[in-house]
C-alpha cells in the first residue's frame, strides 16, 4: 500500500480501483451521478479517498481536460477564506462566486466555481493507488 | 428547463391574508433557495426574503418579517408566501426567483399582481 | 442594511451613443456579489451582469460592468433601441439582499 495519510504525495504504485482513472501518482473517481457536497465527502471517504484537493495549477489543468460544462463537487470550503480538505489556503487559483452563501467550491473545465452546498452536482475523489487490486 | 410559474393576479380586502404560490419545474426543488421580492407600481424591487425547501429553513428582511410567512410543499414542488393584514401599500406585484451555481437570480416567476381594495 | 442608490433615475440616450448609469452602496461589496438585472415594462426582471463584469448569456457585448468597494457601474458603448428598461443593481452580500432603486434608460 502507498503510505501516509490521504493527502500525501502517493509512491508510483501499479494500479486503481475499477472505475478509477489513474493520472500521475493518483487515482481519480469521476461520479456519474449527482450529491451534494456532504454526500459527495462521504461517499470518499468511505472508500478510502478524499474529496478533490487540487496541489497545484499544473494538476488543475490536467484534470480539467477530463471535465465538462457541468460542475464537480471538490474538497474545498470557505470556512473565513477557502481552504481545501486538508487544511492548506486556496492561493493558486482565483474562484468564482456570486452570493456569500456558496461556501462550497467546485471545479468544470473553466475554473473553480463556489456554490451552495445543498446543490446536487458530480464529484471527484482522489486516493493513492494500490499495489494489489485484489483489496478492492 | 426551470419554470417558474405563478397566477396572474389576486384580489384582497384591507386587512386580510393572501397566500401566494410559485409552483417551480424543471429541476431538483428542494435544491436551490426561493427568493420572493415586491414590486410597487413604478418602483423598485424589494427583498421580502428567501427560503430552502431541503430543510424549510429561511431568511427574512426585517420589513416583512412581522406579516410574511414562507413555506414550502414538497410534494408539488411548490413555494408559498402568505402575507397578513394586507393594506393599499401591499399592492404589488409579488416575484418569485431561483438561485443558481454561477449566475445569482437566473430564474423568476412572472409574478403575481396584488391588488387590495375595499 | 446596505443600501444602494442608483443614479440617475432616468436618462435619455440617442442610438449609438455611451452611456453609464452608477450604484453606489452605504456600505462596501464584494465584486463577486454585485449584480444588474434589466426590467423592461410588464415583464420580470431579468439577470444582466452578474459579479460585477460577467454578462449573463445572451447579453449583447455592447454591455459591460466594472467597480469595486461601494461604487459600481454599468456602461453601455454604443446604445440601441432594444436596450430601452429599467436597469437594477443588488448585492449578495448579505442579509438582507437589497435592490437599488433603478436606472430608466429611455431611448430618443
Known amino acids: 500500500l502507498c503510505q501516509g495519510s490521504n493527502y500525501s504525495t502517493c509512491a508510483s504504485c501499479p494500479s486503481c480501483p475499477d472505475r478509477w482513472m489513474k493520472y500521475g501518482n493518483h487515482c481519480y473517481y469521476f461520479s456519474v451521478e449527482e450529491k451534494d457536497w456532504n454526500s459527495s465527502l462521504e461517499f470518499c471517504l468511505a472508500r478510502d479517498s478524499h474529496l478533490l484537493v487540487i496541489t497545484d495549477n499544473q494538476e488543475m489543468s490536467l484534470l480539467q481536460v477530463f471535465l465538462s460544462e457541468a460542475f464537480c463537487w471538490i474538497g474545498l470550503r470557505n470556512n473565513s477564506g477557502w481552504r481545501w480538505e486538508d487544511g492548506s489556503p486556496l492561493n493558486f487559483s482565483r474562484i468564482s462566486s456570486n452570493s456569500f452563501v456558496q461556501t462550497c467550491g467546485a471545479i468544470n473545465k473553466n475554473g473553480l466555481q463556489a456554490s451552495s452546498c445543498e446543490v446536487p452536482l458530480h464529484w471527484v475523489c482522489k486516493k493513492c493507488p494500490f499495489a494489489d487490486q485484489a483489496l478492492f | 428547463q426551470v419554470q417558474l410559474q405563478q397566477p396572474g393576479a389576486e384580489f384582497v380586502k384591507p386587512g386580510a391574508s393572501v397566500k401566494l404560490s410559485c409552483k417551480a419545474s424543471g429541476y431538483t426543488f428542494t435544491s436551490y433557495w426561493i427568493h420572493w421580492m415586491k414590486q410597487r407600481p413604478g418602483q423598485g424591487l424589494e427583498w421580502i426574503g428567501n427560503?430552502?425547501?431541503?430543510?424549510?429553513?429561511?431568511n427574512y428582511n426585517e420589513k416583512f418579517k412581522n406579516r410574511a410567512t414562507l413555506t414550502v410543499d414538497t410534494s408539488s414542488s411548490t413555494a408559498y408566501m402568505q402575507f397578513r393584514s394586507l393594506t393599499s401599500d401591499d399592492s404589488a406585484v409579488y416575484y418569485c426567483a431561483r438561485d443558481a451555481t454561477v449566475e445569482p437570480l437566473p430564474y423568476w416567476g412572472q409574478g403575481t399582481l396584488v391588488t387590495v381594495s375595499a | 442594511e446596505n443600501v444602494l442608490t442608483q443614479s440617475p433615475a432616468i436618462m435619455s440616450a440617442s442610438p449609438g451613443e455611451k452611456v453609464t448609469m452608477t450604484c453606489r452602496a452605504s456600505s462596501s461589496v464584494s465584486s463577486n456579489y454585485l449584480h444588474w438585472y434589466q426590467q423592461k415594462s410588464g415583464a420580470s426582471p431579468k439577470i444582466w451582469i452578474y459579479?460585477?463584469?460577467n454578462l449573463a448569456s445572451a447579453v449583447p457585448a455592447r454591455f459591460s460592468g466594472s467597480g469595486s468597494g461601494t461604487s459600481y457601474s454599468l456602461t453601455i458603448s454604443s446604445v440601441e433601441a432594444e436596450d430601452a428598461a429599467t436597469y437594477y443593481c443588488q448585492q449578495y452580500s448579505g442579509y438582507p439582499l437589497t435592490f437599488g432603486g433603478g436606472t430608466k434608460l429611455e431611448i430618443k
Open positions: 427560503i430552502y425547501p431541503g430543510r424549510s429553513n429561511n
Open positions: 459579479s460585477t463584469s
